[in-house]
Interface confidence: medium
């Protein structure tokens, strides 16, 4: 069937439309287009004869139409008047006629809209605002946007006038937003520029900050006032009802008790004409005296003396507080407070009790701190340490030994070689040493204040050749899967290579084996029973190489899950039951048996002669290793048939 399709159906003014013909019959003589829904010679637009390919304009031809051989009609520069129906009249070669009608609609291109408002400065909770989208356009749809979102549902929002007018009733400050309107028709959509609604509000009740109302004499009073308001509020301050100044901040330096009173902030909005006030009551307290600490012993001796610290001055009905190292007092049997907390006593002082100590006096407003006090605890000397730790030196080098002992006041040092006093210095230096410098080197540390003295003796051997090394261990009986063991090759010597062997082989690569301290220390992490091997260390320098005697690691393990033998579980009445329990364990475990949950004997072997069906049941072997603290067990069912 002959049909007409309009492309597009909705046409913008000034654009073009194609009336496209479908299912055109064959053997045609020609065809004509007409404006309207019927064939009317007065409204013919154009005719076309196929044989001559001749197009003939009709009375309704505007010069904007083009006809194509396939009968389609193109209309250019569309005007509003072009809206409507178009009829195609087809004349076939047999002079039989056929007709088809199509249509399209013409719409104007919309201009960019704008928003007009009936109130540019509405007052909150009082005014309404009506926004109107301009211009008014026929056949246009109107839409509204708030902050680029579609209109929220609200009883205070109302659309009217074909959605062209948006009314906000009883505006609030939250209506301060970006408003846009949009016009749409079938051929265009345009959005207006934003209009920001400027809602006048406030002032709200002002807030005075800071919130604290108690001050100390001598401080500065700095109050700030703020009230939500549009336009911003104008502020005034009143003290005890008397006007002070028209500023947002009130500043009074170096206040006294006389500055106590009621402080009022008034906020005024000149546009809304509203005023709001807030009152705060300020109390100024007199300055209490700054506390200080007195001590009954300025130089106490460690582990001998007690010290009593007292917080001065004594004030009636006052709370005294104490701090040590900027922390509240720790719980300790060596710390005692008097009933009024004014005196803190340290019993048997230690070097860790130096402090600093602070006391505080609490008043209505705050806590006043004393200056910190540090105790001068006399201690030591501890056993001196001689460094470096080498015991072997090669001839020709310089020997430089340093001695240090923890002590207050610092220790005085003396050096002795083979019992003979050398010098009173902390360091001993001997250049170009020989074998004759081998001997016992003693460092003596003396504390003149406590009168105590301590010594450390170090054997030094001067030899190019190293001695036979030995292995020291930090754990002689490590527990499997729990402990680590550190072997150290002794002695420590300069310019020495340290080597290790396990069972006569060089060290295997293992994440559980770690060398440190210049290879002098071998650490086994998370030992296993397989680590129970012979460990040998070697030392090597330019002229010697020696190995230690082997040290066998005794790894404690188990007990593993025990095994009961023989494996049989069925016996004949009258037979002897002889069960043996074994569990891998180091040291050997303790064994015990239970039959049907009842404890029996503490032996590895359970023997019952001439068993009967009464001996049916569960036989449990329990193993425990006292060294590892671990236990294990296994249960076996025994059946005795008559």
């Amino acid at each position: 069937k002959l049909t007409i399709e309009s492309t597009p159906f909705n046409v913008a003014e000034g654009k073009e439309v194609l009336l496209l013909v479908h299912n055109l019959p064959q053997h045609l003589f020609g065809y004509s287009w007409y404006k309207g829904e019927r064939v009317d010679g007065n409204r013919q637009i154009i005719g076309y004869v196929i044989g001559t390919q001749q197009a003939t304009p009709g009375p309704a031809y505007s010069g904007r139409e083009i006809i194509y051989p396939n009968a389609s009609l193109l209309i250019q520069n569309i005007i509003q008047n072009d809206t409507g129906f178009y009829t195609l009249h087809v004349i076939k070669s047999d002079l039989v006629n056929e007709e088809a009608t199509g249509q399209f609609r013409v719409y104007p291109e919309l201009p960019k809209p704008s928003i007009s408002s009936n109130n540019s400065k509405p007052v909150e909770d009082k005014d309404a605002v009506a926004f109107t989208c301009e211009p008014e356009t026929q056949d246009a749809t109107y839409l509204w946007w708030v902050n680029n979102q579609s209109l929220p549902v609200s009883p205070r929002l109302q659309l009217s006038n074909g959605n062209r007018t948006l009314t906000l009733f009883n505006v609030t400050r939250n209506d301060t937003a970006s408003y846009k309107c949009e016009t749409q028709n079938p051929v265009s959509a345009r959005r207006s520029d934003s209009v920001i609604l400027n809602v006048l509000y406030g002032p709200d009740a002002p807030t005075i900050s800071p919130l604290n109302t108690s001050y100390r004499s001598g401080e500065n009073l700095n109050l700030s006032c703020h009230a939500a308001s549009n336009p911003p509020a104008q502020y005034s301050w009143f003290v005890n009802g008397t006007f002070q100044q028209s500023t947002q901040e009130l500043f009074i330096p170096n206040i006294t008790v006389n500055n106590s009173g009621s402080y009022t902030c008034q906020a005024h909005n000149s546009d809304t004409g509203l005023n709001r006030t807030t009152v705060t009551t300020i109390t100024v307290y007199a300055e209490p005296p700054k506390p200080f600490i007195t001590s009954n012993n300025s130089n106490p001796v460690e582990d001998e003396d007690a010290v009593a610290l007292t917080c001065e001055p004594e004030i009636q009905n006052t709370t005294y507080l104490w701090w040590v190292n900027n922390q509240s007092l720790p719980v300790s049997p060596r710390l005692q407070l008097s009933n009024d907390n004014r005196t803190l006593t340290l019993l048997s002082v230690t070097r860790n009790d130096v402090g600093p100590y602070e006391c505080g006096i609490q008043n209505e407003l705050s806590v006043d701190h004393s200056d910190p006090v540090i105790l001068n605890v006399l201690y030591g000397p501890d056993d001196p340490t001689i460094s470096p730790s080498y015991t072997y030196y090669r001839p020709g080098v310089n020997l430089s030994l340093s001695c240090h002992a923890a002590s207050n006041p610092p220790a005085q040092y003396s050096w002795l070689i083979d019992g003979n006093i050398q010098q009173h210095t902390q360091e001993l230096f001997i250049s170009n040493i020989t074998e004759k410098n081998s001997g016992l080197y003693t460092c003596q540390a003396n504390n003149s204040a406590s009168g105590h003295s301590r010594t450390t003796v170090k054997t030094i051997t001067v030899s190019a050749e190293l001695p036979k090394p030995s292995i020291s261990s930090n754990n002689s009986k490590p527990v499997e899967d729990k402990d680590a063991v550190a072997f150290t090759c002794e002695p420590e010597a300069q310019n020495t290579t340290y080597l290790w062997w396990v069972n006569g082989q060089s060290l295997p690569v293992s994440p559980r084996l770690q060398l440190s301290n210049g290879n002098r220390t071998l650490t086994l992490f998370n030992v296993t029973r397989n680590d129970a091997r012979a460990y040998v260390c070697g030392i090597q320098n330019s002229v010697s190489a020696n190995r230690s005697d082997p040290v066998t690691l005794d790894v404690l393990y188990g007990p593993d899950t025990p095994i009961i033998s023989p494996p049989d579980s069925s016996y004949l009445s009258g037979a002897n039951l002889n069960l043996s329990c074994h569990s891998a364990s180091n040291p050997s475990p303790q064994y015990s048996w239970r039959i049907n949950g009842i404890p029996q004997q503490h032996t590895q072997v359970l023997f019952i002669a001439k068993i009967t069906p009464n001996n049916n049941g569960t036989y449990a072997c329990f193993v425990s290793n006292l060294a590892t603290g671990r236990n294990n067990s296994i249960v076996k069912s025994i059946t005795v048939s008559a």
Partner: antibody
Framework: QVQLQQSGAELVKSGGSVKLSCTAS????????MHWVRQGPEQGLEWIGH????????EYAPKFQGKATFTTDTSSNTAYLQLSSLTSEDTAVYYC?????????????WGQGTTVTVSS | ENVLTQSPAIVSASPGEKVTITCSAS?????MHWFQQKPGTSPKLVIY???NLASGVPARFSGSGSGTSYSLTISRMEAEDAATYYC?????????FGAGTKLELK
């Protein structure tokens, strides 16, 4: 296995100098020290000194200070002994010697010796 | 330097006989080492660090001593033991050898 291969015999004129080599196989010379020892005809052993091939540190017996110079070439695993201002007193067999603990034993390795003859 | 004096200079022993060679140091040393040398060959370590048997050395060899006095003992002489034996100290520089003791088979 470990071996120390020394260079061949040398006949040197009095006042001249000579450079002897000792090439190690089976171990890296940087991991040990190389000592040099000499033995005069029908005489005992004399320690000349040693070198640490890793850093070139040397130690000489006072008698050989200025007479002997030790060097190494770690890329070829070779130690060298240079002798200068030679006299008939320096006629001897020169040995290189390396000692190291391996496993539970201490091994002491010697080269086969290089005979140096100083002629007038 | 530390001078090592070996004695005797020459010793003859029959197979199965016990042989002792001594080495005296002019200054105390921490250990002594002993070498064996046969004609036309390089020295070979037999005892290290006073009393330790070097690899491949028969158990009939032993060493002892301390301070300035050390000795090497062969419990039962065998023909293959005929050689010159040197002591060596490594406690101080320069390292020194003894003049040697020639052990002959009787």
């Amino acid at each position: 296995q470990v071996q120390l291969q020394q260079s061949g015999a040398e006949l040197v004129k009095s006042g001249g100098s000579v450079k002897l080599s000792c090439t190690a196989s089976g171990f890296n010379i940087k991991d040990s020290y190389m000592h040099w020892v000499r033995q005069g005809p029908e005489q005992g052993l004399e320690w000349i000194g040693h070198i640490d091939p890793e850093n070139g540190d040397t130690e000489y017996a006072p008698k050989f200070q200025g007479k002997a110079t030790f060097t190494t070439d770690t890329s070829s695993n070779t130690a060298y002994l240079q002798l200068s201002s030679l006299t008939s007193e320096d006629t001897a067999v020169y040995y290189c010697n390396e000692g190291t603990p391996t496993g539970p034993y201490y091994f002491d390795y010697w080269g086969q010796g290089t005979t140096v003859t100083v002629s007038s | 330097e530390n001078v090592l004096t070996q004695s005797p200079a020459i010793v003859s022993a029959s197979p199965g006989e016990k042989v002792t060679i001594t080495c005296s140091a002019s200054s105390s040393v921490s250990a002594m080492h002993w070498f064996q040398q046969k004609p036309g060959t390089s020295p070979k370590l037999v005892i290290y660090s006073t009393s330790n048997l070097a690899s491949g050395v028969p158990a009939r060899f032993s060493g002892s001593g301390s301070g300035t006095s050390y000795s090497l003992t062969i419990s039962r002489m065998e023909a293959e033991d005929a050689a010159t034996y040197y002591c060596q100290q490594r406690s101080s520089y320069p390292l020194t050898f003894g003049a040697g003791t020639k052990l002959e088979l009787k």
